[in-house]
């Protein structure tokens, strides 16, 4: 049997063998398009492409609609791997979502959606997400129903105002939500009442402003 | 959908009091602050105060002040607005409205001036002997 | 307090354009919000921040603002847009929200 050369997502990199996390080449659905991004292949049984990282404040996540539609940053690092193959990816099969999240006095906690999609560019890449479990707060900090993706230059969210511009990053802002996983990065001591830092209100309340965030994604029948 | 459903006409005797209640449905009733707006007949609008559902603070026009109260229930998503010891010249339709709290979620403890984006439908309070 | 100085009326016939101005101390440094009202009903925000439009207004509605005047632009004017417009402040040194005396559009038939 030939071997598997394009991979649609990590948890097909797995599959075949490569066991190892790192950076892998993966391949847009029914297209010859690559993209790099980081798999996770320890974490609750390994096979997970992250989509998004927040580590260290070294990339800057107020970017414009087409950077969040491409992706950005270092797969090694902080990034975002880009709406369009996330839409994608999630309109072939059924994907969860798992968000991992860390604050600066060491703790840690996740919230895991078991059905996770986006909708395409056409509908702003709207998210759409069900049945929530985990640490990370009994409700969603992802308001639901979801809302479309909102950039500095592309202002879809529900509020009167621009959320994107105040509270900076592109998100799915409500108006503007209980999260901001893209907002300004925020060191340890400086992390507090905060307006516009790495937010989910429903783990760690009000102006808290997250040390470190990983958004993950992997079949729903892995 | 997003709608904000008043309470019935009331007709009242100078010196009463009259309360009109204003029910919020389809958002996060906490996350919006609810304006009162009044307009007596043939004439314009007139901005009489803000409560902020989720705190409960409120921010009544000079004009008003001692005469009106505005407090809501959370658990009913609703608001309220009572004016006092009226006046014939009180005679007006109320009007709920909201407007976005975008730092709902962050209290920064500043009020954001978003404009008023949803309305209800109105309330004529009457007030003749 | 801050006060918001509107005309009165404003007539156009349809397919021309209609500029409903609104003149404040300064008002440049302020954002505007403009609403619709038709008779018998609740406003209806179709202008905020100056320019911008909420979603189902439609683009014949548009807004400036510098100096001392703010204006609503309404082109290619429909006999449904007969109504009365507001403009709308917030006075940050009253803490107040201001509504300008309104404009009546007649729509010439």
């Known amino acids: 049997k030939e071997e598997q050369i394009s991979f649609r997502d990590c948890a097909e990199v797995f599959k075949s063998g490569h066991t190892t996390n790192g950076i892998y080449t993966l391949t847009f659905p029914n297209s010859t398009e690559e993209i790099k991004a980081y798999c996770d292949m320890e974490a609750g049984g390994g096979g997970w492409t992250i989509i998004q990282r927040r580590e260290d404040g070294s990339v800057d996540f107020q970017r414009t609609w087409k950077e969040y539609k491409v992706g950005f940053g270092n797969p090694s690092g902080e990034y975002w791997l880009g709406n369009e193959f996330v839409s994608q990816l999630t309109n072939q099969q059924r994907y969860v979502l798992k968000i991992h999240l860390k604050d600066w006095e060491g703790n840690e906690a996740y919230s895991l959606y078991e059905h996770f999609y986006l909708s395409s560019e056409e509908l702003n890449y709207r998210i759409h997400l069900k049945g929530l479990t985990g640490t990370a707060g009994k409700i969603s900090s992802i308001s639901q129903p979801g809302n479309d993706f909102s950039t500095k230059d592309g202002d879809n969210d529900k509020c009167i105002c621009k959320c994107s511009q105040m509270l900076t990053g592109g998100w799915w802002f409500d108006a503007c939500g209980p999260s901001n996983l893209n907002g300004m990065y925020y060191p340890q001591r400086q992390n507090t009442n905060k307006f516009n830092g790495i937010k989910w209100y429903y783990w760690k309340g009000s102006g808290y402003s997250l040390k470190a965030t990983t958004m993950m994604i992997r079949p729903a029948d892995f | 959908q997003v709608q904000l459903v008043q309470s019935g006409a009331e007709v009242k005797k100078p010196g009463a009091s009259v309360k009109v209640s204003c029910k919020a449905s389809?958002?996060?009733?906490?996350?919006?602050?609810m304006h009162w707006v009044r307009q007596a007949p043939g004439q314009g609008l007139e901005w009489m105060g803000w409560?902020?559902?989720?705190?409960?603070?409120?921010n009544y026009a000079q004009k008003f002040q001692g005469r009106v109260t505005m407090t809501r229930d959370t658990s009913i998503s609703t608001a309220y607005m009572e004016l006092s010891r009226l006046r014939s010249d009180d005679t007006a339709v109320y009007y709920c409205?909201?407007?976005?709290?975008?730092?709902?979620?962050?209290?920064?403890?500043?009020?954001?001036?978003?404009?008023?984006?949803?309305w209800g439908q109105g309330t004529m309070v009457t007030v003749s002997s | 307090s801050y006060v918001l100085t509107q005309p009165p009326s404003v007539s156009v016939a349809p397919g021309q354009t209609a500029r409903i101005t609104c003149g404040g101390n300064?008002?440049?440094?302020?954002?505007v919000h403009w609403y619709q009202q038709k008779p018998g009903q609740a406003p209806v925000l179709v202008v905020y921040?100056?320019?911008d439009r909420p979603s189902g207004i439609p683009e014949r509605f548009s807004g400036s603002n510098s100096g001392n005047t703010a204006t609503l632009t309404i082109s290619r004017v429909e006999a449904g847009d007969e109504a009365d417009y507001y403009c709308?402040?917030?006075?940050?040194?009253?803490?107040?929200?201001?509504f300008g005396g309104g404009t009546k559009l007649t729509v010439l038939s």
């Open positions: 389809g958002y996060t009733f906490t996350g919006y602050y």
């Open positions: 921040d100056d320019s």
């Open positions: 300064n008002i440049g440094s302020k954002s």
């Open positions: 409205a909201r407007s976005p709290n975008p730092y709902y979620y962050d209290s920064p403890g500043y009020y954001y001036p978003a404009a008023f984006d949803i």
């Open positions: 409560i902020n559902p989720n705190s409960g603070g409120t």
């Open positions: 709308q402040v917030w006075d940050s040194s009253s803490d107040h929200w201001v």
